[in-house]
């Protein structure tokens, strides 16, 4: 999912894929967002380091697990790429940096009256990427009011220096504010000349054009189609530039298509993603994962939700299919484009929509009006610890939620097993979003042992906690991984971002939901909660959550599921859905088992014979 938090005084160790100079952490984050492999970044402001070469350093990083170890570094700022962050994805950066000179190739100098005028000139110059402006108080009189338009090979400054009375910034072309205007036409059977700045493989000219638009130095392109005479050059997209900013010549050439970058378009820029799916085409690349899904759209959605996935191929070969599901190959490459494009295959291919700034609506495949009380649909991999506890008697049905806390351990509510203590009737499904996706062939875990808290009594609300030991350990994936547990007796942390998830009823007299629902609910003090439940004892081993006005809550079928809170960028299992008076009633918060109060019990029960805890706890 989308992770927007920044970590101050922290630096990610390892995982470097690129480095550059940027004036601040936000610009560094934007470069990370648009880099095909960057998931994390670390930025060193001038104040954070004495080494002049590393000042303003922006370090782009990748990680197979999606995270890297953080080391303390005073002044450093780290964070995540905004891939998957929908409308927050933008290459537009309006800030002006005072007292900073962003260095590059100075190709144009003029006198202007203000920094805004200088930025406007840069925005209206086809080759300008960034600029520096010497103010009226600059120490050298002859340079005062000078506006220097600049570019560099990578589109970022080649160096950044602290310099009084100088102001710098970036072109606003990515904000669709250029006065230049753009050429929307594409030209069939025409090849442009000039300098090639990059070469990528694309399935069509429109993808080639979008890549050109977001490449820092591409002004125009030529695409060689899949029937181009030289086989090794088919589907090659050549990104080009020239001194003048326009092609110096063009040559009629069968089976080529040429056009221009759309970065200078005034009203709107194309989205930085490619939504078209290409039937009969295979995209080659490094294998990230292979999963069975029903349909090419679900394959694209799966790729989009797996943040490292750049493109995919959905195979319809008989040997790659089981019933209605076929293999979805999730892939990546160094430049974000396929390393091979093959035609006439039994596959369909396309790209991740992780950079689409319209957000999830472009990949939404299931629309439903019935939801967990006041909740909304979750998306793939959003709550990878959520499991569905199902009972198979004559029919099979979802009864409770649970949380994966280790390879072989699930934490849930004790009351889920009231009247059903037999482990053989239970099936545990992990890594799922839609209950309707479960077929007779869907893998599930069986229970090796049910450990109900020794002080739990049926029909009482106390000690409503149980551990499930699975018969076989689960592998962790993007869609199936554990939730961290809180520290023992965690009472000092103030949690402000808490969510309850589950497939439970959408109203008191409702039905189990198909899509995993999520609801953001504030925690309520135990004192406040006790006032609302005067007939019950709200103990310190319980935590309450809900809105005074009601309307949002867990409900039947959510029991045993997680109440998770995000603190300092990390999700923790704060509560287990336990009980409440009805669902989402006014002034009747939900009551949850407080996990922190049971840490000793959890650790004791999950200790293996070698004495190591078998669940996830925060470092």
């Amino acid at each position: 999912g989308c992770l927007t938090q920044l970590y101050e005084n922290a630096f990610f160790r390892g995982g470097d894929v690129a480095s550059m100079y940027t004036p601040n952490a936000q610009y560094c984050q934007m470069r990370c967002t648009f880099h095909p492999r960057c998931l994390l970044f670390s930025f060193l402001p001038a104040s954070s380091i004495n080494d002049m070469e590393k000042r303003f350093g922006c370090f782009l990083k990748d990680s197979v697990t999606g995270t890297l170890p953080k080391v303390h570094r005073t002044g450093a700022v780290s964070g995540h790429s905004l891939k998957q962050c929908g409308h927050q994805i933008s290459a537009c950066h309006r800030d002006i940096y005072k007292g900073v000179d962003m260095r590059g190739v100075n190709f144009n100098v003029s006198k202007v009256s203000s920094v805004e005028e200088c930025q406007k000139r840069c925005t209206s110059n086809i080759r300008c990427q960034f600029f520096s402006y010497a103010t009226q108080t600059f120490h050298k009189a002859e340079y005062r009011n000078n506006c220097l338009l600049k570019y560099s090979p990578g589109g970022t400054p080649t160096a950044i220096k602290v310099l009084s009375n100088v102001e710098s910034g970036f072109s606003l072309k990515p904000c669709a504010l250029s006065e230049i205007g753009c050429h929307m036409n594409i030209f069939q059977h025409l090849a442009f000349s000039d300098v090639d700045v990059a070469r990528v493989l694309t399935p069509d000219a429109f993808v080639c054009r979008t890549i050109c638009t977001y490449h820092p130095n591409c002004l125009f392109f030529t695409f060689y189609t899949n029937v181009w005479k030289i086989e090794s050059q088919r589907n090659v997209c050549l990104l080009k530039t020239s001194e003048s900013g326009t092609p110096s010549s063009s040559t009629p050439q069968e089976n080529t298509i040429s056009g221009y970058s759309l970065l200078t378009c005034k009203r709107t820029l194309p989205e930085p993603c490619h939504s078209k799916i290409y039937p009969g085409v295979d995209f080659g690349g490094e294998e990230l994962n292979v999963t069975f899904v029903k349909g090419v759209n679900v394959c694209q959605e799966t790729c989009t939700k797996m943040i490292r996935c750049q493109f995919f191929t959905y195979s319809l070969l008989p040997e790659d299919c089981k019933e209605e599901k076929c293999k979805c190959f999730l892939r990546l490459s160094m430049d974000g484009s396929p390393t091979r494009i093959a035609y006439g295959t039994q596959g369909s291919s396309g790209y991740s929509l992780r950079l689409c700034n319209t957000g999830d609506n472009s990949v939404c495949t299931t629309k439903t009006s019935t939801r967990i009380v006041g909740g909304t649909n979750s998306s793939w991999g959003e709550w990878p610890w959520q499991v569905s506890l199902q009972v198979k008697l004559t029919a099979q049905r979802h009864l409770c939620g649970g949380s994966l806390i280790g390879h072989q351990w699930v934490l849930t509510a004790a009351h889920c097993f009231d009247g059903l203590p037999l482990q053989d009737v239970w099936r545990i499904y992990s890594g799922i979003l839609n209950l309707s996706d479960i077929t007779k062939d869907t893998p599930f875990s069986q229970i090796k042992e049910i450990i109900i808290h020794q002080n739990y009594k049926v029909s009482e609300g106390n000690h409503d906690i149980a551990l499930i030991k699975l018969q076989a350990p689960l592998n962790y994936t993007e869609f199936q991984k554990p939730i961290c547990l809180p520290s023992k007796g965690d009472t000092s942390t103030i949690y402000t971002n808490c969510w309850v998830t589950g497939w439970g009823f959408s109203k008191e007299k409702g039905e189990i939901q198909n899509i995993l629902q999520k609801v953001n609910i504030p925690l309520v003090t135990n004192e406040e909660c006790q006032k609302r439940y005067q007939d019950y004892k709200i103990t310190q081993r319980m935590v309450c959550a809900g809105y005074k006005e009601g309307g949002k809550d867990a409900c039947k079928g959510d029991s045993g599921g997680p109440l998770v809170c995000k603190h300092n960028g990390m999700w923790r299992l704060v509560g287990i859905t336990s009980w409440g008076e009805g669902c989402a009633r006014r002034e009747q918060p939900g009551v949850y088992t407080k996990v922190a109060e049971y840490m000793d019990w959890i650790l004791e029960k999950t200790q293996s014979s070698d004495g190591k805890a078998q669940m996830q706890s925060p470092a």
Partner: antibody, heavy 120, light 107 residues
Framework: EVQLLESGGGLVQPGGSLRLSCAAS????????MLWVRQAPGKGLEWVSG????????AYADSVKGRFTISRDNSKNTLYLQMNSLRAEDTAVYYC?????????????WGQGTTVTVSS | DIQMTQSPSSLSASVGDRVSITCRAS??????LNWYQHKPGKAPTLLIY???SLQSGVPSRFSGSGSGTDFALTISSLQPEDFATYYC?????????FGQGTRVEIK
């Protein structure tokens, strides 16, 4: 001159069959995706079926799936549409069209059309 | 399937008029949008591909615009030979779908 010429239309009873042909000339037939598009009386254009340059990849509108079969013979520069189990609602002018590459740049050459009438 | 909705369904105009036809897609199709002219008894002809690009041999009075879900075909100065039915068509997803057509008649 680039040309497409349809043939094989006619009057047929419901449940009957017809085979339409489209002869291509003036271009490298094997490099193009080919399509059939129809227009029912008083209605708009409706895509019927498409086939990839090599003939391996085919697609059909839901309304004709299981009844119509598109094929091509690149050695004869000819596109075909085998229509079985014809219904009254299949009555239309059938056009064959070529689409460069994936068809993302539209259907740039069309035939004059052949009329299919399904009636008892 | 992606639905394409054209408006108006018909319009009356005089020679020399500036005419615009709009086309809306039920979901974003980027610039995978083409426009055709169709006259009775004739083969349709491609006017605009990729939302903006003029097909070879088509007069420059025809122009296309838009991206995402909203598109337009504009005839800057209507000529006698332009009276016909115009169709938009998306080439983003299979099946390729057409708008219902806009009939341009002489006033």
């Amino acid at each position: 001159e680039v040309q497409l010429l349809e043939s094989g239309g006619g009057l047929v009873q419901p449940g009957g069959s017809l085979r339409l042909s489209c002869a291509a000339s003036g271009f490298t037939f094997s490099q193009y995706k080919m399509l059939w598009v129809r227009q029912a009386p008083g209605k708009g254009l409706e895509w019927v079926s498409g086939i990839g340059p090599s003939g391996g990849l085919t697609a059909y509108a839901d309304s004709v799936k299981g009844r119509f079969t598109i094929s091509r013979d690149n050695s004869k520069n000819t596109l075909y549409l085998q229509m079985n189990s014809l219904r009254a609602e299949d009555t239309a002018v059938y056009y064959c069209a070529r689409a460069p590459w994936f068809g993302e740049l539209g259907m740039d050459v069309w035939g004059q059309g052949t009329t299919v009438t399904v009636s008892s | 399937d992606i639905q394409m909705t054209q408006s108006p369904s018909s319009l009356s105009a005089s020679v020399g008029d500036r005419v615009s036809i709009t086309c809306r897609a039920s979901q974003s199709i980027s610039t995978y949008l083409n426009w055709y002219q169709h006259k009775p008894g004739k083969a349709p002809t491609l006017l605009i591909y990729g939302a903006f690009s003029l097909q070879s041999g088509v007069p420059s009075r025809f122009s296309g615009s838009g991206s995402g879900t909203d598109f337009a075909l504009t005839i800057s100065s209507l000529q006698p030979e332009d009276f016909a039915t115009y169709y938009c068509q998306q080439s983003h997803s299979t099946p390729p779908t057409f708008g219902q057509g806009t009939r341009v008649e002489i006033k």
